[in-house]
Interface confidence: medium
């Protein structure tokens, strides 16, 4: 059956931790992505932002995991209203911001 939301979120957090704590050089060669609003539809928005980064094996697992949280198919170039379209940040900062937000959600028991 499907993985319980709390387990899936924990696994996503663990993967984001592995990425952020393991940097010896700028993540994805310092690639820039659109910032997002960390609100209700953030999983799809995060995937829409990160899917535009190609050739970066470090975030491929994260992209796959985020797709499991997003109910619709996401492809490169697709954007939702959740993006702050005038702000681009480095992938490393994007991933860390996402990690810190998800940690708070997990601690508060907001698994979905």
């Amino acid at each position: 059956g499907p993985v319980p939301p709390s387990t899936a979120l924990r696994e996503l957090i663990e993967e984001l931790v592995n990425i952020t704590q393991n940097q010896k050089a700028p993540l994805c060669n310092g690639s820039m992505v659109w910032s997002i609003n960390l609100t209700a539809g953030m999983y799809c928005a995060a995937l829409e932002s990160l899917i535009n980064v190609s050739g970066c094996s470090a975030i491929e697992k994260t992209q796959r995991m985020l797709s499991g949280f997003c109910p619709h198919k996401v492809s490169a170039g697709q954007f939702s209203s959740l993006h702050v379209r005038d702000t681009k940040i480095e992938v490393a900062q994007f991933v860390k911001d996402l990690l810190l937000h998800l940690k708070k959600l997990f601690r508060e028991g907001q698994f979905n």
């Epitope: 924990r10 592995n18 952020t20 704590q21 940097q23 700028p26 993540l27 490393a92 990690l99």
Partner: antibody
């Protein structure tokens, strides 16, 4: 209230062994990762070892690898540190500390014991 | 293994702002925690995850982290803030915890 109490410290000769214990109370011990951290007199903090909430994984600082063993008994709410082949440079106050376990690494130490002094001297 | 560099000492007058730095390669990507240790006492967590504060810690304590430097800021410093302060991260390459060397905060 939540508490960690270390015991087992003392004076020991180089090459000898010592076993430290840390008794936990006031919280659900089995859900927390646990660590040992030491502090030599007048020096800074040095991480020694950690053990996952269920005892399934353990990690050690290079300086103690092969000599120290960390264990826990969740039924008794106790953390242990078996220290063998002790050296003068192991002289320090040894603290046990807990870390929220829910994603295993990079968590802060939110509760510390008061420490137990270990002196290695001939 | 990963190295964290802190200034040995920082001095500040009461009521002023103290800033204690913690340097490390790309530390901005890591989660940094800060501890306060007073003489003869165990360390106490004052800031975690770069900038979050445990419930019993005053709002005067704050943290930031970007690039190669994390900073603990103590505003409106009081005599009771005099202590050693340590930064801490997790080092994935060694699967272990790393502490900075510590900074002694002196309140003039």
């Amino acid at each position: 209230q939540m508490q960690l109490v270390e015991s087992g410290g003392g004076v020991v000769q180089p090459g000898r062994s010592l076993r430290l214990s840390c008794a936990a109370s006031g919280f659900t011990f089995r859900t927390y990762g646990m660590h040992w951290v030491r502090q030599a007199p007048g020096k800074g903090l040095e991480w020694v070892a950690d053990i996952w909430y269920d005892g399934s994984n353990k990690h050690y600082a290079d300086s103690v690898k092969g000599r120290f063993t960390i264990t826990r008994d969740n039924s008794k709410n106790t953390l242990n540190l078996q220290m063998n082949s002790l050296r003068a440079e192991d002289t320090a106050v040894y603290y046990c500390a807990r870390a929220p376990q829910w994603y295993l690494v990079a968590e802060p130490f939110d509760l510390w014991g008061q420490g137990t002094m270990v002196t290695v001297s001939s | 293994s990963y190295v964290l560099t802190q200034p040995p000492s920082v001095s500040v007058a009461p009521g002023q702002t103290a800033r204690i730095t913690c340097g490390g390669n790309l530390i901005g990507s890591k989660l940094v925690h800060w501890y306060q240790q007073k003489p003869g006492q165990a360390p106490v967590l004052v800031v975690y995850d770069d900038s979050d504060r445990p419930s019993l810690i005053p709002e005067r304590f704050s943290g930031s982290n970007s690039g190669n430097t994390a900073t603990l800021t103590i505003s409106r410093v009081e005599a009771g803030d005099e202590a050693d302060y340590y930064c801490q991260v997790w080092d994935s390459s060694s699967d272990g915890v790393v502490f900075g060397g510590g900074t002694k905060l002196t309140v003039l």
